[in-house]
């Protein structure tokens, strides 16, 4: 799986859409999970609705909301007032019994807020993160970064990457 | 930037019990997976274990498992190594380490280590 | 455990040389999401070790790019093109795929 990333600017709310086969995932739930690092678990934020012909219904689980067109094959994650300790390695996952699909993995980035002078030394500013060793990019704001790329992107995006 | 300060020398002796701190500053503390590893003179490097200071997830090594507990404490944004039991064994430089990005876990940043020194 | 076996133990070099360092896994070292964990560390005398290479062959940030990590499944090699005096040191490979994870016993590079 490639590694979209997306950034957001701290205090803003950030979107963040994956995609999917809607007839291969038909009548399946779907899930955002938060995952500990590169190599740990994948811990759940919050799942659809229980009735997946409700999966429309937005459904939050503190500040992080998520909605489901199962029509169009697209889950929307909202992750309200973004901040510092939002960021990092998440999945959109659809669900089947006990397991789980991955449908996206998604690097989220959160943006120093260049109105706010306050400390910013826990926030990321374009420029400062370790290269992506084999992204590729999109555009809440999204791209994939290739290959040893250091991303320099603009104010609040969406980028891609293995 | 990034900062993991560790307390420069223990000297313990046999049976005692350390609890090593690391504390660290200038990232989210809570977003990075925080490494301990073992330095003995002629012996090269051992790592102990790891944790995940947003969830507390552990992994340890089965070696130091039943005498090593590694804790975090997100108000002071420090790591812990409780090691117990010690023998002089045990004497040599641990060090803290923290990965380097969400999307690169080499140990990028580490401690300048803390000398235990385990004599009667 | 997954046993890391570095070779040689002691490479004496002149500055400007090339010097190559292997590390062999006892075990394929790719981990269950398709990443293979290997890394590169230097430790020089009285400092903490420092992060070389990552992901096999990825370069850490500011690492010169006379390093060069390469290899696959279990057997690894990090050259230095041209040797220069701060590159002298205990090298370290380590595997992070599997835990227990384990680090190589170390290669001492040292002027001839």
């Known amino acids: 799986h490639n590694t979209t990333v997306f950034q957001g600017v701290a205090g803003q709310s950030l979107q963040v859409s994956c995609p999917y086969d809607s007839m291969k995932h038909w009548g399946r739930r779907k899930a955002w999970c938060r995952q500990l690092g590169e190599k740990g678990p994948c811990q759940r934020v919050v799942s659809t609705h229980n009735l997946w012909l409700l999966s429309f219904l937005r459904r939050w689980n503190g500040s992080t909301a998520i909605t489901d067109d199962t029509l169009g094959g697209t889950l929307t994650i909202t992750l309200r007032n973004l901040q510092p300790h939002d960021a990092g390695l998440y999945q959109c996952q659809s669900l089947h019994g006990s397991e789980a699909d991955t449908l996206r993995k998604v690097l989220v980035e959160v943006l120093a807020d260049p109105l706010d002078h306050r400390d910013a030394g826990d926030l990321w500013f374009p420029g400062e993160s370790e290269s992506f060793e084999d992204a590729h990019v999109e555009h809440s704001i999204s791209r994939s970064l290739l290959e040893g790329e250091i991303p320099f992107p603009p104010t609040s995006h969406h980028h891609h990457h293995h | 930037q990034v900062q993991l300060q560790q307390p420069g020398a223990e000297p313990l002796t046999p049976g005692a019990s350390v609890k090593m701190s690391c504390e660290a500053s200038g990232y989210t503390f809570t977003n990075f997976w925080i490494t301990w590893v073992k330095l003995r003179p002629g012996q090269g490097l051992e790592w102990?274990?790891?944790?995940?200071?947003?969830?507390?997830?552990?992994n340890y090594n089965e070696k130091f498992k039943s005498r090593a507990t590694l804790t975090v404490d997100t108000s002071s944004t420090t790591a812990y190594m409780q090691l117990s039991s010690l023998t002089s064994e045990d004497s040599a430089v641990y060090y803290c380490?923290?990965?380097?990005?969400?999307?690169?876990?080499?140990?990028?940043?580490w401690g300048h280590g803390t000398l235990v020194t385990v004599s009667a | 455990d997954v046993l890391m076996t570095q070779s040689p133990l002691s490479l004496p070099v002149n500055l400007g040389d090339q010097a190559s360092i292997s590390c062999k896994s006892s075990q394929n070292i790719v981990h269950s999401n398709g990443n293979t964990y290997l890394e590169w560390y230097l430790q020089r005398p009285g400092q903490s070790p420092k992060l070389l290479i990552y992901?096999?062959?990825n370069r850490f940030s500011g690492v010169p790019d006379r390093f060069s990590g390469s290899g696959s499944g279990t057997d690894f090699t990090l050259k230095i093109s041209r040797v220069e005096a701060e590159d002298l040191g205990l090298y370290y490979c380590f595997q992070g795929s599997h835990v227990p994870y384990t680090f190589g016993g170390g290669t001492k590079l040292e002027i001839k």
């Open positions: 102990i274990g790891d944790i995940y200071p947003g969830s507390g997830n552990t």
């Open positions: 992901k096999v062959s």
């Open positions: 380490a923290r990965e380097a990005y969400y999307t690169n876990p080499g140990f990028a940043y």
